[in-house]
Structures are given as structure tokens and as C-alpha cells.
Amino acid sequence: YETKMDLVQTSEVMQESLYPAAQLCPSFEESEATPSPVLPDIVMEAPLNSAVPSAGASVIQPSSSPLEASSVNYESIKHEPENPPPYEEAMSVSLKKVSGIKEEIKEPENINAALQETEAPYISIACDLIKETKLSAEPAPDFSDYSEMAKVEQPVPDHSELVEDSSPDSEPVDLFSDDSIPDVPQKQDETVMLVKESLTETSFESMIEYENKEKLSALPPEGGKPYLESFKLSLDNTKDTLLPDEVSTLSKKEKIPLQMEELSTAVYSNDDLFISKEAQIRETETFSDSSPIEIIDEFP
């Protein structure tokens, strides 16, 4: 598979999100073959004592609240949806344009990413990988991710890649076997990789393309739905560039428990028109033949 990795950080909270096209986030539902492993909470360092430029495209989260600069108590209990809609393919993305000015540290906002997938029938789930590293002053889009059909509250080891589901109706298998999660090299030159694309008169940052196909399936949560996940990343480009001294190396910080957040999905058919309105703004919408992944970080 081809790997283009972008390390995304928000206010010294470094998140490395690996999103294979049509990937599946492991679901440790009850299974005779594979007992549910007991894993610790995903931890995420979060020094919250400085302001950073906020750039990129973010979906407005009306219910979100800013992080207190002096507070590290933002354990977020995520609730994956029980009943996302099953539409096929084509879905639009509403983006909030950010000018890149320095502002107070807020909770990571979502951006909707739409990645193009070539093979439609795969069911997939996007999972947020939260890394115990810090990177300061890079534009910080957080991936808003549409996924489906699995309870995903178990943590995922650092630097691990997700595996896509190429068999929608197969039984769950153990994703966490040694050979199913290749390590991501932790190289310094990979910590700040910006892949710029140009789509519909907009320059996009943080392109992540993965094609990794393995059989994997998860039982849906109550009322859950299967979805197609094909993505083309659509991010607003900030016109501000980074200063060299704004990029810092990765460092270990105090660990704060953080659970996986809610996953939700919608998939649409080619001829379908998807209308998405954010609570406070209406933006032009980007359409693709596939469904975006949405990962929502909630920090009370």
C-alpha cells in the first residue's frame, strides 16, 4: 500500500491519524475465536499553556467548549452512534475557513475528509489514533470521520495502521496480531510532512492516502449501519506558512487518559445530493463519489 502520512497537531497535542481508504477499526465484540483484549486507555499528552496558530479547515462543533489553559482534565467519553444512516457514496463536506491567526487553545475541531476509494464494496471504519507525542505550531486540522457499524472504544497502539474490511459479512477477527499492525517508523523528517493537493480551486493540506486490504469485520452496535467509505480529502488551505522555529521535535509528556470518540457515518449514492449544515455557518460543499469519514473529538 502507498503511505502518505501527515502528522497533525493541535495546540501541542499531537495526533497522528492514519486513515487507510476503506479501513476498518477493530471491534472487540464478543467472539468465540477471539476474546476481547483488555487494553488501557489511549493516552494523549496535552500541555495546554500556549497558543498556537489554528489553520486548516474545521467543521464547526456547536457543542464544543474551549479547553482551559490551566486544565488538563478533559477526558472525553465518546459515544459511537447506534444508528447512522446507510446512504451510499457521494457526500459533501462543509468546511469552516480559518485564516490561520493565533487564537486561544480550543478543542480540536473536526474537518471532513473525503478520500477517493476505487473499490466500492468495502465496509470500513475510521479510527482515531492518538499519539503520545507533541508537536508545536503546525496547522492543526483534526479529521472528521465518517465510519460505521462497530463499537470502537478500545484504544489502538501507537504508530499502528488500521486494516480495511474487504469482507462485510465475515466474522470479527483479531486485528491486534503482530503481523496485522505494522509499525510506523518514527522518523524526525516525518513529523512535519505537508502534502498539498489542489482540488476545485482550493489547495489542500494533510493528504493521507492508504490502500491496505485485509479481511476484517466487526459486529455493528445496536442499530448500527454498514457504510461505504471512499474518500477524497477536502481541506481548506491556510495562507499562512509555518516559521521554522515553530516546528518542534516530538517529546513525551504527561499522559492523560482519552477514550476513542464517537464514530458516525453516512454513505450516499452517486446521484444523491448530500446537504450538510453546520449550526452556525453554511459553506460551499464539496462532493465526491464516496462517503467521508468523520471522527469527532469532544473535550468537555
Epitope: 452512534p81 466500492a120 455493528p220 445496536e222 469527532i296
Partner: antibody, heavy 118, light 112 residues
């Protein structure tokens, strides 16, 4: 016991606006997509739109996208529907719905009636 | 939008007799995941709609087994093996495979 209780309906003049509410109990509102569906007198059901659990994604049926704004307050377990510039054809029973396409039961409120008349 | 056409518009059935309602879609409701997201709803007089069947043929809990759903692609059928008095009302098919969700126009089941 699952309950979806709509309110806010009533008589409204053409060109006016109103905000419908739906208070939910009996299931985890924060984990559910929610929808609004309406039914004009003697007519069939019409899907208005839906909102995902954290309000980051809101879908509307294309022909109605400029008339309605769906929102929610998870702290209050409440779903909202803002109806703007109402016309006579907006006269209907408005249902709050927890739609489910597989496995779990879906839930419908009892509906709140909106009458547009001068 | 996907158009769901229900026939007949009205169905007058004697209690104990079978009934059949058709729902035809303007395009296939088969999802790429292999599932077909078609629900059947019953709206009894003065009540809210209630789902009877999901995924074409799966009965909701509490729904009598005299109701059966069948079909694939664009043609779907709801059958009642023996109509009972409580079955009267409006029946709707409802698709979720394509955006936006759409309902059929409804079929009114009357008791003779």
C-alpha cells in the same frame, strides 16, 4: 420506556417562523442520529432531515434545506427543528424520529401539529 | 431522489383474508454492502408510524409473523397472511439506501 415528546407546534402566520422541540428519554440520545419527518393532512410521510450525535453533520432533503434548521442539545436530551418562512404547505404533523435501519427498534414521537394560516 | 411507488392506494380486505402491498423503487435499493435498506411502516389511525419490517424481510420485535416482507432490487412486497382488525391503517415503504431517505405514497388498508 422510550419516549419522544414533540412540542412547539401551533398556529403560525405565513412568513413566520417557529421552533419545534423533541425531548427524548429511555435511550441514549447522545449516541443516536435523530431525524424529523412530517406528514401533511391526508398526505404521506416526508423526510426532512437528520442530525448526527454531536451535531457535526446535518443532512437535509434537498428541496427543504433552506426552510429547516435541525439542531440538538445533548445535555437536555432535546432535538430541535427551526422552521422559517412558513407557508400553507408547511401545515403538517411533525414527527421526531430515532431512525434505525437494522437491529434495533426505531422510535417515533407522537408528533406536533403545525398549522400555517393567516 | 428515489421514487417509491406503492400499489394499490387502497386495499379493502375481509378479516382473515390475505393482503399484499407492492412497493416499486425508481432505482435499485441494493446497497454496495449487499444489504437492502427498505423498511415497512404501519400507521394506525390517529397514531404515529411504527416499523414492522426492516432490511426487506426482517420482522421487528412484537410484530406478528403473519406479516412478511420480500423482494429485491426495485420490487418489494409486504404480505399479510390473514388480515386482522388491528392491521388497518396506512402502510408505507421507506428506503434508506440512497440520500435522501424517501417514503412510498402509502397504501390504505381497510377492513371490509
Amino acid at each position: 420506556e422510550v419516549k419522544l415528546l414533540e412540542s412547539g407546534g401551533g398556529l403560525v402566520q405565513p412568513g413566520g417562523s417557529l421552533k419545534l422541540s423533541c425531548v427524548v428519554s429511555g435511550f441514549d440520545f447522545r449516541r443516536n442520529w435523530m431525524s424529523w419527518v412530517r406528514q401533511a393532512p391526508g398526505k404521506g410521510l416526508e423526510w426532512i432531515g437528520e442530525i448526527n450525535p454531536d451535531s457535526s453533520k446535518i443532512n437535509y432533503t434537498p428541496s427543504l434545506k433552506d426552510k429547516f434548521i435541525i439542531s440538538r442539545d445533548n445535555a437536555k436530551n432535546t432535538l430541535y427543528l427551526q422552521v422559517s418562512t412558513v407557508r400553507s404547505e408547511d401545515t403538517a404533523l411533525y414527527y421526531c424520529v430515532r431512525p434505525v435501519w437494522m437491529y434495533a427498534m426505531d422510535y417515533w414521537g407522537q408528533g406536533t401539529s403545525v398549522t400555517v394560516s393567516s | 431522489d428515489v421514487l417509491l411507488t406503492q400499489t394499490p392506494l387502497t386495499l379493502s380486505i375481509t378479516i382473515g383474508q390475505p393482503a399484499s402491498i407492492s412497493c416499486k423503487s425508481s432505482q435499485s435499493l441494493l446497497h454496495s454492502d449487499g444489504k437492502t435498506y427498505l423498511n415497512w411502516l404501519l400507521q394506525r389511525p390517529g397514531q404515529s408510524p411504527k416499523r414492522l419490517i426492516y432490511l426487506v424481510s426482517k420482522l421487528d420485535s412484537g410484530v406478528p409473523d403473519r406479516f412478511t416482507g420480500s423482494g429485491s432490487g426495485t420490487d418489494f412486497t409486504l404480505k399479510i397472511s390473514r388480515v386482522e382488525a388491528e392491521d388497518l391503517g396506512l402502510y408505507y415503504c421507506w428506503q434508506g439506501t440512497h440520500f435522501p431517505q424517501t417514503f412510498g405514497g402509502g397504501t390504505k388498508l381497510e377492513i371490509k
